[in-house]
């Protein structure tokens, strides 16, 4: 091997690079010196390294070792971030729309029904909200109370418009009524499927998004260990006690310190592919009642079709409640009081046809298809790190943590490094705590996202046909009935005009290789587009 | 006209009990949600509580929760707001409110009654 | 809770003047954003909902603007009675929440 380099006499240029990182401080030797006391840069000969040096470089080691981690991390989390908003945002969007939209229906179709209805819609797009969101509610409550609020309304404004207003205590008699009747068919189970189905996809959706922000903060924080400091400044600084400050780490040897330092992050990567592979196929399953957006949009029809289902059965209704609901206080409603032949009508829904644009779908698949080019993202960070810090090219005349070497033997390395500490040792630490941790919540979010991937085919709890539903001119999957289209009803044209209203507020300059992002209002749906070019 | 009247107002020391009352005309009372939203001296606007029309859905702020009762009697159209267990923090102008769901906003308020906690 | 921040605590213009008042959330409340007008001794009174709205009877000089989490209320030419506290208040998220006022006040 050839002969080290003459070292620095004076010390000089190892005091003009330290003066760089520790303003001030007098601790480089002015001339050489034996080095007994240094525990990283262990010298073969005369250095220009103090223990105080050592010390500061390994501090400043670490948090060059932090700021690559971020820099390495930095395009991925934008991109997650930047979704999580988006699609949160999109998704307030989507909620209110549909209560427009059936807000609309009630003033166009039923104006007796208002101001009243509008509560009962407002509080429930309120609760739908909140249920994305993470609130603790459930979704069959939510539909319940929507119904059971509507029918007494119903019941006093438009089947029996001349009740006096001393018949109000009548509305508990007629919200149990309502239940026990199945005033509205089967159009409340129905909405109830498709709700919480649509729903919890979108909440464990938003969750998932959010723990990928989480991940990706928790493993950028990192603080790297002792061990891991003393690797890293061996093999970025070691050299410049010799005074070779030109001199760049093997390739090789920075894998194997990386490899070393990253053990415990590199661990996550199983969970990171499967993170990622799972939230594919719970999107590319986000279509139809697991599709929030064209459920909650085709809402205000379904509900127009229960509200004329119960009209169809006014007459029969009446009667049968008059009786039950002579006594509220008693609330005795029973069977007996039941006809066996009320509410047998078929109801035979028909599907609202949209017409595609820019959606929240396609949306949702490109936002996939990024995160799959991230998904060696753990298992490729040793590698990524080495490439974007200075290493020599071909391992040619490189640092190998001891001396300058032609090429770089792992195995010399090794052996040269057995006294100081060993390398494999570092290795089988198990990972950090922070870092099990996210692998837990990682393996959780996977677990739920498996557990919400939606079966192919027929995806409609099959029992809503032997309740009073036929396909008729559905198409071959029940869950396509999202609803029909009654007279007097909005067409939504478009499901998704409404995306061009979608600004965020992230500060789109600042994103990393991207100095051209249009604004929302350069273009109709541009909000969409434009995020497909933020890598 | 629309509007809405209040009454029950003044100085009870801490840890007594008031009955604030709102009485509504000119609008269905029975069809809409109401609220009570406070302000206290030289501050800002927070809400209280709420009640829907047919008295299922009640919600209340996190600072007067287990020490407020909102309730409603449709029939005489008003809205009432027993205040328990009552600290100085309760000290402010509590205003009833209309909320109308379409336009999600407090679209009628009424005049405001002081109620000052104070030893 | 969603934290509402108004921006200025203080705008003294002349009347004539165009008041500009900020309202921005500590998250996206999209556009369920309304602005209030409070004078002193008076209850609140409704003048913007879903964030550009105007309520009913109140005048074309007033104007809302923004969604998100950044919104605007502007008064194209200050009247005498203009001269108020403004409040806005969200409704995206459980509690509905107020910003703590901005006071236009004459110069």
């Known amino acids: 091997q050839p002969p080290p380099p003459p070292p620095d006499a004076t010390c000089h240029q190892v005091r003009s690079f330290f003066q760089r990182l520790q303003p001030g401080l007098k601790w480089v030797p002015e001339t050489p010196v034996p080095g007994s006391d240094l525990q990283v840069c262990l010298p073969k000969g005369p250095t220009c390294c103090s223990r105080k040096m050592e010390e500061k470089y390994q501090l400043t080691a670490r948090l060059n070792m932090e700021q690559l981690l971020q820099s390495a991390s930095m395009e991925l989390k934008f991109l997650i971030i930047q979704n999580a908003a988006v699609f949160q945002e999109a998704f307030e969007i989507v909620v209110r729309h549909a209560k427009n939209y059936t807000n609309a229906m009630f003033k166009n179709n039923y104006p007796s029904l208002t101001p009243q209805a509008f509560e009962f819609v407002g509080e429930f797009f309120t609760d739908v909200s909140l249920y994305i969101l993470g609130s603790d509610i459930n979704v069959d409550d939510m539909v319940n109370e929507l119904f059971d609020s509507l029918f007494p309304v119903i019941y006093t404004q438009l089947m029996n418009p001349g009740l006096p207003d001393s018949a109000l205590d009548i509305n508990e008699c007629l919200r149990g009524a309502r239940r026990d009747l199945k005033v509205f068919g089967n159009f409340p189970k129905l909405i109830m499927t498709q709700v919480s189905k649509s729903l919890q996809v979108t909440r464990i959706f938003l969750q998932a998004l959010n723990l990928g922000i989480e991940v990706i903060n928790t493993t950028d924080h990192l603080k790297f260990s002792k061990d891991c400091g003393r690797m890293l400044t061996r093999m970025w600084y070691c050299s410049y006690c010799q005074g070779l400050m030109m001199v760049k780490p093997c390739g090789g040897y920075c894998n194997v310190v990386m490899q070393g330092c990253m053990a415990g992050v590199v661990e996550i990567d199983k969970y990171w592919r499967e993170y990622i592979l799972s939230l594919e196929e719970l999107v590319n399953g986000m279509y139809r009642i697991y599709d929030m957006e064209n459920v909650l949009l085709g809402l205000f029809s379904t509900i127009h079709d229960s509200i004329q289902y119960v009209q169809k059965n006014a007459g029969k209704l009446t009667t049968t409640i008059g009786k039950l609901c002579a006594h509220s206080q008693q609330r005795q409603y029973r069977s007996a009081y039941y006809p066996e032949d009320l509410f047998i009508d078929k109801k035979v829904l028909k599907v609202a046809h949209v017409e595609h644009e820019e959606t929240l779908s396609s949306r949702r698949r490109e936002l996939i298809q990024k995160l799959k080019s991230f998904i060696s993202f753990y298992s490729a960070l040793p590698g990524y790190i080495c490439s974007h810090s200075p290493v020599a090219e071909n391992d040619t005349l490189c640092w190998n943590g001891q001396e300058l070497v032609e090429r770089y033997s792992q195995k010399a390395a090794r052996n040269g490094m057995k006294n100081q500490f060993n390398l494999h040792e570092l290795k089988m630490k198990g990972p950090e705590p922070v870092v099990s941790q996210i692998i837990d919540k990682l393996k959780h979010i996977n677990q739920l996202l498996r557990t919400m991937s939606m079966p192919k085919g027929r995806v409609l709890d099959k029992n809503l046909d032997e309740e009073g539903f036929e396909s008729g001119d559905c198409g071959d999957d029940e869950d396509e009935c999202i609803g029909g289209s009654g007279d007097g009803m909005i067409k939504v044209k478009n499901q998704l005009r409404f995306l061009a209203e979608l600004a965020y507020d992230l500060d789109v300059d600042d994103a990393p290789g991207n100095s051209q992002q249009a604004t929302p209002k350069d273009n109709e749906i541009s909000t969409f587009h434009n995020l497909g070019n933020v890598h | 006209q629309v509007q809405l009247v209040q009454s029950g107002g003044g100085l009870v020391q801490p840890g007594g009990s008031l009955r604030l009352s709102c009485a509504a005309s000119?609008?269905?009372?029975?069809?809409?949600?109401m609220n009570w939203v406070r302000q206290a001296p030289g501050k800002g606007l927070e809400w209280v509580s709420y009640i829907n029309s047919g008295r299922s859905t009640i919600k209340y702020a996190d600072s007067v929760k287990g020490r407020f009762t909102i309730s409603r009697d449709n029939a005489k159209k008003s809205l009432y707001l027993q205040m328990n267990s009552l600290r100085d923090e309760d000290t402010a102008v509590y205003f009833c409110?209309?909320?109308?769901?379409?336009?999600?906003?407090?679209?009628?308020w009424g005049q405001g009654t002081m109620v000052t906690v104070s030893s | 809770e969603i934290v509402l921040t108004q921006s200025p605590a203080t705008l003294s213009l002349s009347p004539g003047e165009r008041a500009t008042l900020s309202c921005r959330a500590s998250q996206s409340v999209s556009s369920y954003l309304a602005w209030y007008q409070q004078k002193p001794g008076q209850a609140p009174r409704l003048l913007i909902y879903d964030a550009s709205n105007r309520a009913t009877g109140i005048p074309a000089r007033f104007s809302g603007s923004g969604s998100g989490t950044d919104f605007t209320l502007t008064i194209s030419s200050l009247e005498p009675e203009d001269f108020a506290v403004y409040y806005c208040q969200q409704r995206s998220n459980w509690p509905p929440t107020f910003g703590q006022g901005t006071k236009v006040e004459i110069k």
């Open positions: 409110a209309r909320w109308e769901w379409e336009q999600e906003a407090f679209d009628i």
């Open positions: 000119g609008f269905t009372f029975s069809h809409y949600t």
